[in-house]
Amino acid sequence: IIDGAPCARGSHPWQVALLSGNQLHCGGVLVNERWVLTAAHCKMNEYTVHLGSDTLGDRRAQRIKASKSFRHPGYSTQTHVNDLMLVKLNSQARLSSMVKKVRLPSRCEPPGTTCTVSGWGTTTSPDVTFPSDLMCVDVKLISPQDCTKVYKDLLENSMLCAGIPDSKKNACNGDSGGPLVCRGTLQGLVSWGTFPCGQPNDPGVYTQVCKFTKWINDTMKKHR
């Protein structure tokens, strides 16, 4: 997260980290006791999922292995359209004050809405500084028309843009798959942006979760 600050302790109990061994790979969100939602470009063969603490490496955190993941069938490694994936935990997460399910959206929020993006990704770019504490930054949803002015044909229908004019505030590497939460509901998953991260007027691009609630629910049912 670029130009952010540590999240208020326990304010993101649905935030998870996907680890490869002990190394941060991506962010994600807990949908229910068995399922984590993240970005399709975060696909690995096996995951260790960190839940229940804002601090990576916290011994009090839950760590659960996951071996099965289901990319959206329409994901493209070229255009990055449909960049979302469900990861099935090998054992159930224990819900608590620090481990809660995210609220999936019942509607798509409009441009101008203030949202929070969070993650343990690098806080500097191109030189990297990985924080141990979960970082947050507030950004505003940007209309597809305005975002297309920046990204032209790279922007697809189910992509959502967010940023602050003339500001560095943005996601970065390691934040992928993590949540963009607006008015208490999950509206986006960190997908991509320009490099170095945090270039003013280059919005962050997110998978627009409100377009995929049916696929999310259907996939969890199908692979119960």
Partner: antibody, heavy 127, light 108 residues
């Protein structure tokens, strides 16, 4: 300003191992989120990618050379290295090291262009 | 592997000419294409990244376009220092990273 400099023997015997080092100055190989790349160019021919290594020391190799190639990083010396085993005359080329600049973050991070290059070093394979 | 085919392999042009070089990928690579210039005895130099973005410090007479499988590098008004060989390169998410065969721009 970042600079890259290749070094290593200019002559290698057939069946031996070619070893080259790229020294990075003006930037830190251990803290910058770039790819570090080896490319070669046989005399009078085009460019061929050998392989790359990233910030996490993950390596990516050209399948046609994979069984013979090792790329590694020495962060204490701000260097990355190439080893190519069992060389033949076909491995005679100018060898370049370069920095791969990602085209984006997240889903666009694994795509890159080489924005800084060493001047190249000529390696001849001959007995 | 994705094959990158450049055309023409060589061309002769005069100072001030508009020059166009094309690069075709054997399958779609979205906008993940870069262009390089190489002068004899020198290392390649990045001109264009992501199909159409001009690398910092590169003169604006160079431009790139295209998406999917067909790409173009255009030099709007050829200068004496532009006589060189030009290569396209497909970004390496689709390994291996591959270059086109090159286009040599010579003085007419």
């Amino acid at each position: 300003q970042l600079q890259l400099q290749e070094s290593g023997p200019g002559l290698v015997k057939p069946s031996e191992t070619l070893s080259l080092t790229c020294t990075v100055s003006g930037g830190s190989i251990s803290s910058d989120d770039y790819y570090w790349v080896w490319i070669r160019q046989p005399p009078g021919k085009g460019l061929e990618w050998i392989g790359s290594i990233d910030y996490f020391a993950s390596t990516y190799y050209n399948p046609s050379l994979k069984s013979r190639v090792t790329i590694s990083v020495d962060t204490s010396k701000n260097q990355f290295s190439l080893k190519l085993s069992s060389v033949t005359a076909a491995d005679t080329a100018v060898y370049y090291c370069a920095r791969g600049r990602p085209l984006g973050y997240g889903a666009r991070h694994d795509y890159y262009g080489m924005d800084v290059w060493g001047q190249g070093t000529t390696v001849t394979v001959s007995s | 592997d994705i094959q990158m085919t450049q055309s023409p392999s060589s061309l002769s042009a005069s100072v001030g000419d508009r020059v166009t070089i094309t690069c075709r990928a054997s399958q779609s690579i979205s906008s993940y294409l870069n262009w390089y210039q190489q002068k004899p005895g020198k290392a390649p130099k990045l001109l264009i990244y992501s199909a159409s973005s001009l690398q910092s410090g590169v003169p604006s007479r160079f431009s790139g376009s295209g998406s999917g499988t067909d790409f173009t590098l255009t030099i709007s008004s050829l200068q004496p220092e532009d006589f060189a060989t030009y290569y396209c390169q497909q970004s390496p998410y689709f390994p291996p990273l591959t270059f086109g065969g090159g286009t040599k721009v010579e003085i007419k």
